[in-house]
Interface confidence: medium
């Protein structure tokens, strides 16, 4: 693994992909989604220590300024770098439809 | 303003563009950047309450799951939606170079 992928806080503590099981009720979708009834939501969770999975120059700057001015500038944040598509079967006024969402499930993560 | 742009926490408390003045020394660049000597770093800072500047479906899901499982799922995070370019004049092994960075200064912000 690159240096930027080794978590200095211990295994699993830094920014990475997590899976959270959620029902349609959990997601607030019960009224308009028919299927699936449960979703394995992949999302980005974890700390962003210095040099860990820095997305770009902006993330580097943010970390440097956070160290200097922690009360003003927050640390970089763990967010999706890309997404996996997901199809939902939805209720519509006329019946049902299949809708592909390209921005629903995180595929991989980085720090911004 | 759209509902998603009205901050329920009070003016300026939610995710928005902030400007932070930083010297090359602050950024750790003094040895390899010639010019400019200071940068007005634009970055995204602020809270992401429900429905505020949600970037996509993933952000909606994250907020819903955060309310259900706050210890497991963090709230959405304020990050750049796009960037402004910036030129740095840099020292190189062979002399100097002009480098345009497309991912250095945040242009606008959203919650992911």
């Amino acid at each position: 693994a690159r240096n930027g992928d080794r978590c200095p806080l211990g295994p699993g503590r830094c920014c990475r992909l997590h899976t959270v099981h959620a029902s349609l009720e959990d997601l607030g979708w019960a009224d308009w989604v028919l299927s699936p009834r449960e979703v394995q939501v992949t999302m980005c969770i974890g700390a962003c220590p210095s040099q860990f999975r820095e997305a770009n120059m902006h993330a580097q700057i943010k970390m440097n300024l956070h160290r200097l001015k922690p009360d003003t500038v927050p640390a970089p944040c763990c967010v999706p770098a890309s997404y996996n598509p997901m199809v939902l079967i939805q209720k519509t006024d006329t019946g049902v439809s299949l809708q592909t969402y390209d921005d629903l499930l995180a595929k991989d993560c980085h720090c911004v | 303003a759209r509902n998603g742009d009205r901050c329920p926490l009070g003016p300026g408390r939610c995710c928005r563009l902030h400007t932070v003045h930083a010297s090359l020394e602050d950024l750790g660049w003094a040895d390899w950047v010639l010019s400019p000597r200071e940068v007005q770093v634009t970055m995204c800072i602020g809270a992401c309450p429900s429905q505020f500047r949600e970037a996509n479906m993933h952000a909606q899901i994250k907020m819903n799951l955060h309310r259900l499982k706050p210890d497991t799922v963090p709230a959405p995070c304020c990050v750049p939606a796009s960037y402004n370019p910036m030129v740095l004049i840099q020292k190189t092994d062979t002399g100097v170079s002009l480098q345009t960075y497309d991912d250095l200064l945040a242009k606008d912000c959203h919650c992911v």
Epitope: - | L34, S35, P36, R37, E38, Q40, P85, T100
Partner: antibody, heavy 119, light 107 residues
């Protein structure tokens, strides 16, 4: 008070070289870049290049590479520009100008040094 | 190199009038532009940086505007001390070229 004091006017022969000085005072010399600008016939302004006194780095307008050499002496807070192999085309007023820290404009200028190249 | 085209080249106006000087860049310079004033026999003086930021001590009758490739310097209610030459300069990639200048003369 920020001041940039340049050396006096020069009359030099074609083919000769010469060095213009720019003594900086009233601010932290290494904290600001120094630029050099040429003005011909009281009109056209041309950027020659800059030097970063903190790390010694220089960048030149390609047009002046080999014509101008920029240096600094941190101990005396003085910037120098050496002009090489002078021709009549080099007759002009030359300015040193401090670069603002934030961004790249030039906020303080020397009084200018008039250089006349003539045999 | 980026070319800076300044217009007009000269302008004859009366005290109290409003003038606008424009500068067009040959490509997008992302507001990395300064304006200078130069009096006869004197060094240039910074008026505006980053396209719109008035330099310290510059009267509020001066204002800079623009984006992309088009920029302007506006002087309202011209005073006798405002007469002289004005130059724009870009800072987007080197060389940092200047416009050809605008000479502002008293009518």
């Amino acid at each position: 008070e920020v001041q940039l004091q340049q050396s006096g006017p020069e009359l030099v022969k074609p083919g000769a070289s010469m060095k213009i000085s720019c003594k900086a005072s009233g601010y932290s010399f290494t904290g600001y870049n120094m630029n050099w600008v040429k003005q011909s016939q009281g009109k056209n302004l041309e950027w020659i290049g800059l030097i970063n006194p903190y790390n010694g780095g220089t960048i030149y307008n390609q047009k002046f590479k080999g014509k101008a050499t920029l240096t600094v002496d941190k101990s005396s807070t003085t910037a120098y520009m050496e002009l090489l192999s002078l021709t009549s085309e080099d007759s002009a007023v030359y300015y040193c100008a401090r670069e603002v820290r934030l961004g790249n404009a030039m906020d303080y200028w020397g009084q200018g040094t008039s250089v006349t190249v003539s045999s | 190199d980026i070319q800076m085209t300044q217009s007009p080249a000269s302008l004859s106006v009366s005290v109290g009038e409003t003038v606008t000087i424009t500068c067009r860049a040959s490509e997008n310079i992302y507001s990395n532009l300064a304006w200078y004033q130069q009096k006869q026999g004197k060094s240039p003086q910074l008026l505006v940086s980053a396209a719109t930021n008035l330099a310290d001590g510059v009267p509020s009758r001066f204002s800079g505007s623009g984006s992309g490739t088009q920029y302007s310097l506006k002087i309202i209610s011209l005073q006798s001390v405002d007469f002289g030459s004005y130059y724009c300069q870009h800072f987007w990639g080197t060389p940092w070229t200047f416009g050809g200048g605008t000479k502002l003369e008293i009518k």
